[in-house]
């Protein structure tokens, strides 16, 4: 009995559900009463889930597995694994027995994205060119272990005195801390890239150090050079800092955040106290850090409409300002694929394949490709429509003449998150059966 599973590992994010695909070809007259299906861990042979004696025997794996019972009769023996954990990583074997017997193993690769690195500098006061400083880059709760790269403001690698440590927490997720010891030049940007090798995701943090004192008559206000990227619905920190002089007190401080283009007031701190949010009550200062020169703004429950430039004005005796850009993003959903017509297909037939992905931002890039990854640039029409929250739904239609058989894949790419959502449909010339979601 031929049992088919994917060649490539199934990659699943921690906390999401994964489908371990497995299929067989039922003969005419096949009934579920004849079927024995067993899923087990390949190495330890621990039972995961089984279907015997015509019924689902249930999960033997922390009650987190399920079969696609309504698809079993068509030969779909796939296993749904819920709330994936790091400990689930490994090989699962699908055993199918009817009259004959067959088995195949599928690998589950677990992954978790690393957080945007936070950067700290020690010492962080009274720096002069030639001083040695320690820059620490910390990124949290990723899997598997990260690769860490340091670079200057031009992207050139910094391969000097770097020490990187990675520690797994009780869920098996890694926190990474990388320390760069560097001798300061006149000024410089130091960036840390934390790469997840499975997700091919790069998390980026940077710090710009200007050792010489700012000229008198101006407060030097520092903000990140790169746009702050925030997911819709999450909180974002718009970083802004200044260097308080000895004897500085908050009574001397005037801090104003406003929208750069419209000059609309967002938040202010004047006359020694927080004047509160003037921006839909969704902003806050880090009041306990203000005296140390941290004028950053917390923006809660980010919306698409928040995207743009925010200016941080700081006035003590002197005055300074700088603008920071907020780039809003939302990941696109896994594309759903529809086929028209979807019955009695023959080579030479023209079909319309529609790929739909929802609630992303900004507008997506859509690519079609065949089963080998070669681009399909034929008759494609893509439309994107924003909903009332400004999130886009994308629909891309490919008209194609069928070959003997083929796989048609749609990649919906979020250009800001550099996230690719992938959907595919395989047409074999027989009546269609879609793979389960």
């Amino acid at each position: 009995l031929e049992v088919q599973v994917p060649e490539d590992p199934v990659v699943a994010l921690v906390g999401t559900d994964a489908t371990l695909r497995c299929s067989f070809s039922p003969e005419p007259g096949f009934s579920l009463a004849q079927l024995n299906l067993i899923w087990q861990l390949t190495d330890t042979k621990q039972l995961v889930h089984s279907f015997t004696e015509g019924r689902d025997q249930g999960s033997a794996y922390a009650n987190r597995t399920a079969l696609f019972l309504d698809l079993l009769a068509q030969g779909n023996a796939s296993l749904r694994l819920q709330r994936v954990r790091v400990a689930d990583e490994g090989s699962f074997t699908c055993f199918v027995s009817i009259r004959d017997f067959g088995s195949a193993a599928v690998s589950l690769q677990v992954a978790a994205p690393y957080s945007k690195p936070s950067m700290t500098l020690e010492p962080n006061k009274d720096l002069r060119p030639g001083d040695t400083v320690t820059i620490t880059c910390s990124s949290y709760r990723g899997y598997p272990e990260a690769e860490v790269f340091w670079q200057d403001g031009q992207g050139a690698p910094l391969t000097g005195n770097v020490t990187t440590s990675q520690m797994a927490n009780e869920q098996g997720l890694f926190d990474v801390h990388s320390v760069l010891r560097v001798v300061l030049g006149a000024n410089g940007t130091y960036s840390c890239l934390v790469r997840n090798p499975v997700l091919q995701q790069d998390a980026h943090g940077s710090i710009t150090i200007t050792p010489q004192r700012s000229p008198t008559g101006a407060v030097e206000v520092q903000v990140p050079e790169d746009p702050v990227v925030a997911l819709v619905g999450t909180d974002a920190t718009l970083r802004c800092s200044f260097s308080p002089e000895p004897g500085f007190s908050l009574a001397q401080l005037n801090l104003i955040w406003q929208l750069t283009d419209t000059k609309q007031l967002v938040h202010s701190f004047t006359e020694g106290r927080d004047q509160g949010s003037a921006y839909a009550n969704r902003t806050a200062l880090f009041l306990d850090l203000l005296a140390q020169g941290n004028a950053s703004l917390r923006l809660q429950r980010v919306r698409v409409a928040d995207e743009g430039s925010f200016t941080c004005f700081v006035s003590i005796r002197d005055f300074g300002s700088a603008a920071v850009s907020l780039q809003v993003a939302a990941p696109y959903s896994k594309p759903s694929m529809t086929l028209e017509p979807n019955k009695d297909l023959r080579p030479g037939d023209t079909v319309t394949i529609t790929c739909s992905s929802y609630r992303g931002y900004p507008e997506a890039e859509v690519f079609w490709q065949d089963g080998q990854g070669a681009p399909l640039t034929g008759n494609v029409t893509t439309s994107q429509m924003a909903n009332e929250q400004g999130l886009f739904d994308v629909h891309s239609v490919l008209r194609v003449v069928l070959g003997a058989n083929g796989t048609y894949s749609c990649l919906v790419r979020n250009p800001v998150l550099q996230q690719d959502a992938h959907g595919s449909v395989t047409i074999t010339g027989q009546p269609m059966t879609f793979p389960p979601e």
Epitope: G155, A156, P157, T189, S191, Q200, D202, E225
Partner: antibody
Amino acid sequence: EVQLQQSGPELVKPGASVKISCKTSGYTFTEYTMHWVKQSHGKSLEWIGVINPNNGGTTYNQKFKGKATLTVDKSSSTAYMELRSLTSEDSAVYYCARPHSLLRLRREFDYWGQGTTLTVSS
Amino acid sequence: QIVLTQSPALMSASPGEKVTMTCSASSSVSYMYWYQQKPRSSPKPWIYLTSNLASGVPARFSGSGSGTSYSLTISSMEAEDAATYYCQQWSSNPLTFGAGTKLELK
């Protein structure tokens, strides 16, 4: 569409200087660094250096320090490379090239200028 | 600096033939990048991060390797593949290229 349009061929005398331009369009100039690459006739590629248009920061190949100076003009989205004290060894095609990303490990150059041919001859 | 040595310097292949060229680094590098260049043209990105094909590159190309040893393979040579291929690293300064492998059609 991203484009990098370089200035035309140059014929200069030994000892002179030359300034090659690379005018960009189709993307935000300050969001990507700009690299310069030398290709001597029938030979391989040599990296000269890189400039960050956002703040003018530069990183050079030690071999070209003192030979090449990289600058930008943000208002016209143009990058420049000046080469000085020219000798016949500097005769080559010079390319400007934009990398895929500064914030990711994608260190490949996905857009290149058409090249500027420099001939140093008396 | 890291020296990249490409071999062979010159090779020829018939249509349909499998082709493999190598790039050896004098010190370990994290990732390798490859470019294709044809006469009187600028280089084109071909493979990034060791094994990923750049946009528009045919699926018959593949890249692999780690540490100091990397390779580019064409599963079935086609006429349009005749070109010079350069490897590139930027794991340490300065960024360096290999001397190139010139692939001709037999």
